[in-house]
Interface confidence: medium
């Protein structure tokens, strides 16, 4: 898609320093020492790709803004009127490195681009990769991509929320719910109806990818053997198999419970029953109370029997606007009796109650194993009339375009370096030339990363 720029731009000094350290560690050569210069150059795919765009041309060329209206929505909010721009990140440490930016908040956004050629799910893997930076953080919104199904009706300037997609992949967040979607649309071979299949949630904590304001690299790898991997920043955060790890499962169960089956009226599900032979003992007193007064208790010394717990407040005064005809006779509000504060208690003393040692309660026969117990009733199993078995879910609907159809409460979501390819090596090269450079410029490069990038650049000048 995007051709490479010939503009060569210096990266800021802090990255130069990192590179200088790497250069210093190389063996001396006879050439006179010179200050190494790291330059940003738009990445160029190192092999065949279905799609690649680094946006470093600075324009939206090749991308189509949707003119569609969102279905089932009031006219004033139905339009895809969210703005898109191609520009550098606000805090960019790589001048000249541009990306696609979702500019507006609380608006519907839709933009898409045609692939160089449709992707057919045959014998090669599918690899989809792109970068996202939530420059203002993210309150509620998505940054996922849709791979739009190749259909005769596909019309990119009418791209909307109901446009058929084959795969949806990428980050999404609302409130404290942090998601990394991988959904594919599977066609039920019996009914012809498409059903969304969702990958299980990653075990990894995704929160930092949304909150740290760094650029993160999202990769989806789908293999012809139905296995998949999802990576963030080149580390696997989720993996599985399309047959075993999607919800709902691709293939329904062979058998289902018979919806017509009914539990027989005489079916006994009670594991225990009262012993029918048991008899209440003669000395069992069902009327004895659970609690009785403690006859051992004595009134504490200094108890003030004649003092009330509460007394009228002597400092209270009748309000001036008190009308006895309307409000009745005025009474001072009650306060805790100050004389009781130094005494163990005031008022009539009552014995505390204790558990009755002779309390037995209502007699019940003991429980015994039910000799007629039949177990918990379950409906019988019958062959599932909707059963089918698709052992090759990887063979999905071909797709011929990539689209971003998003709503966000936060603006300035930065996307960059989209690539769709069938070769992991090409995708990794692209990542090193794009995201790897950003990572290094952020000062977050692990030891050796910059050195590897320099070596890679020397191998592929």
């Amino acid at each position: 898609h995007d051709g490479h720029d010939d503009d060569v731009i210096d990266i800021e000094d802090d990255l130069d320093d990192v590179i200088e350290e790497v250069e210093d560690s190389k063996p001396d050569t006879t050439a006179p020492p010179s200050s190494p210069k790291v330059t940003y150059k738009a990445p160029v795919p190192t092999g065949e790709v279905y799609f690649a765009d680094s946006f470093d041309r600075g324009t939206l060329s090749g991308w189509i803004l949707s003119k569609a209206k969102k279905d089932d929505t009031d006219d004033e909010i139905a339009k895809y009127d969210g703005k898109w721009e191609v520009e550098e990140m606000k805090e960019s440490k790589l001048p000249g490195d541009k990306g696609l930016v979702l500019m507006s908040r609380a608006k519907h956004h839709a933009i898409s681009a045609k692939l160089n050629k449709p992707f057919l799910f045959d014998t090669k893997p599918l690899i989809v990769q792109y970068e996202v930076n939530f420059q203002n953080g993210i309150e509620c919104g998505g940054a996922y991509v849709k791979l739009l199904s190749k259909t005769p009706e596909l019309n990119l300037d009418q791209f909307h929320d109901k446009t058929p997609y084959t795969i949806m992949f990428g980050p999404d967040k609302c409130g404290e719910d942090y998601k990394l979607h991988f959904i594919f649309r599977h066609k039920n071979p019996k009914t012809g109806i498409y059903e969304e299949k969702h990958a299980k949630r990653p075990d990894a904590d995704l929160k930092t990818y949304f909150t740290d304001k760094k650029t993160h690299l999202y990769t989806l790898i789908l293999n012809p053997d139905n296995s998949f991997e999802i990576l963030v920043d080149q580390s696997v955060v989720n993996s599985g198999n399309l047959l075993n790890d999607m919800t709902p499962p691709v293939n329904p169960s062979r058998e289902i419970e018979d919806p017509e089956d009914r539990k027989p009226e005489d079916w006994d599900e009670r594991p225990k029953i009262p012993d029918p032979e048991a008899v209440k003992p003669d000395d069992w007193d069902e009327d004895a109370p659970a609690k009785i007064p403690d006859e051992e208790a004595t009134k504490p010394e200094g108890w003030l029997d004649d003092e009330p717990e509460y007394v009228p407040d002597p400092d209270a005064e009748k309000p001036e606007d008190w009308d006895e005809d309307m409000d009745g006779e005025w009474e001072a509000p009650q306060i805790a009796n100050p004389r009781c504060e130094s005494a163990p208690g005031c008022g009539v003393w009552q014995r505390p109650v204790i558990d009755n040692p002779n309390y037995k309660g209502k007699w019940k026969p003991p429980m015994i194993d039910n000799p007629s117990y039949q177990g918990i009733w379950k409906p019988r199993k019958i062959p599932n009339p909707d059963f089918f078995e698709d052992l090759e879910p990887f063979r999905m609907t071909p797709f011929s375009a990539i689209g971003l159809e998003l709503w966000s409460m936060t603006s300035d979501i930065f996307f960059d370096n989209f690539i769709i390819c069938a070769d992991r090596r090409i995708v990794d090269d692209w990542a090193n030339d794009g995201w790897g450079l950003k990572k290094a410029a952020d000062g977050a490069a692990e030891p050796g990363v910059v050195g590897q990038m320099i070596e890679a650049a020397e191998e592929r000048p």
């Epitope: 057919l120 005769p152 599977h186 698709d390 609907t397 071909p398």
Partner: antibody
Framework: EVQLVQSGAEVKKPGASVKVSCKAS????????MHWVRQAPGQRLEWMGW????????KYSQKFQGRVTITRDTSASTAYMELSSLRSEDTAVYYC??????????????????WGQGTTVTVSS | QSVLTQPPSASGTPGQRVTISCSGS????????VYWYQQLPGTAPKLLIY???QRPSGVPDRFSGSKSGTSASLALSGLRSEDEADYYC???????????FGGGTKLTVL
């Protein structure tokens, strides 16, 4: 048993129209698209178009656009292909065909596993 | 003139392996799936291969399909007399916005 049964042979004069029917049985008619393919004597197969039996959407081959109309009657589980302004080169066997049931991607035609027996249309003055 | 090009004829003896080719362009085979049909005289075509290399149930594994770039091929191994028929390749064509068939290859079992 899944089958498609087509109407009988037709003889038409140039300029006339012909309407061929295709009755489906043994499956849910509205869950599949129905395609029409013809074959002139000794010639290759030629795709004419399809109808989504569920929603009635149609797509026609550029070659037949304007002359062919494909319709369906869901209550009768029947698809129809009407070809107008007939000429002698339209003499052919006309087939209706349904997409392979395990192929999820039926919106992109190609894999037809169930075919009608064919209807011979002869255009002659 | 067919958009997909097949050799008009092919032949082999029983037990032999025969390959039929189908040549197209980037707008059809290059970006779409390939299908293969067998047509016995006076009958409707029968689907042999779909999605380039998949066999519907009931089609023997003597039939296999493959695709590379803008060409596809159908291979028949262990040739039998009942394999004598016309064989057609097909693919969707993006520029014509329609399904196109090859001209057909007549296979003779000697």
């Amino acid at each position: 048993e899944v089958q498609l049964v087509q109407s009988g042979a037709e003889v038409k004069k140039p300029g006339a129209s012909v309407k061929v029917s295709c009755k489906a049985s043994g499956y849910t008619f509205t869950s599949y698209a129905m395609h029409w393919v013809r074959q002139a004597p000794g010639q290759r197969l030629e795709w004419m178009g399809w109808i989504n039996a569920g929603n009635g959407n149609t797509k026609y081959s550029q070659k037949f656009q304007g002359r062919v109309t494909i319709t369906r009657d869901t209550s009768a589980s029947t698809a129809y292909m009407e070809l107008s302004s007939l000429r002698s080169e339209d003499t052919a066997v006309y087939y209706c065909a349904r997409v392979l049931h395990v192929l999820r991607y039926f919106d992109w035609p190609g894999a037809f596993d169930i075919w009608g027996q064919g209807t011979t249309v002869t255009v002659s003055s | 003139q067919s958009v997909l090009t097949q050799p008009p004829s092919a032949s082999g003896t029983p037990g032999q392996r025969v390959t039929i080719s189908c040549s197209g362009s980037s707008s059809n085979i290059g970006t779409n799936y390939v299908y293969w049909y067998q047509q016995l005289p006076g009958t409707a075509p029968k689907l042999l291969i779909y999605i380039n290399d998949q066999r519907p149930s009931g089609v023997p594994d003597r039939f296999s399909g493959s695709k590379s770039g803008t060409s596809a091929s159908l291979a028949l191994s262990g040739l039998r007399s009942e394999d004598e028929a016309d064989y057609y390749c097909a693919a969707w064509d993006d520029s014509l916005s329609g399904l196109v068939f090859g001209g057909g290859t007549k296979l003779t079992v000697l």
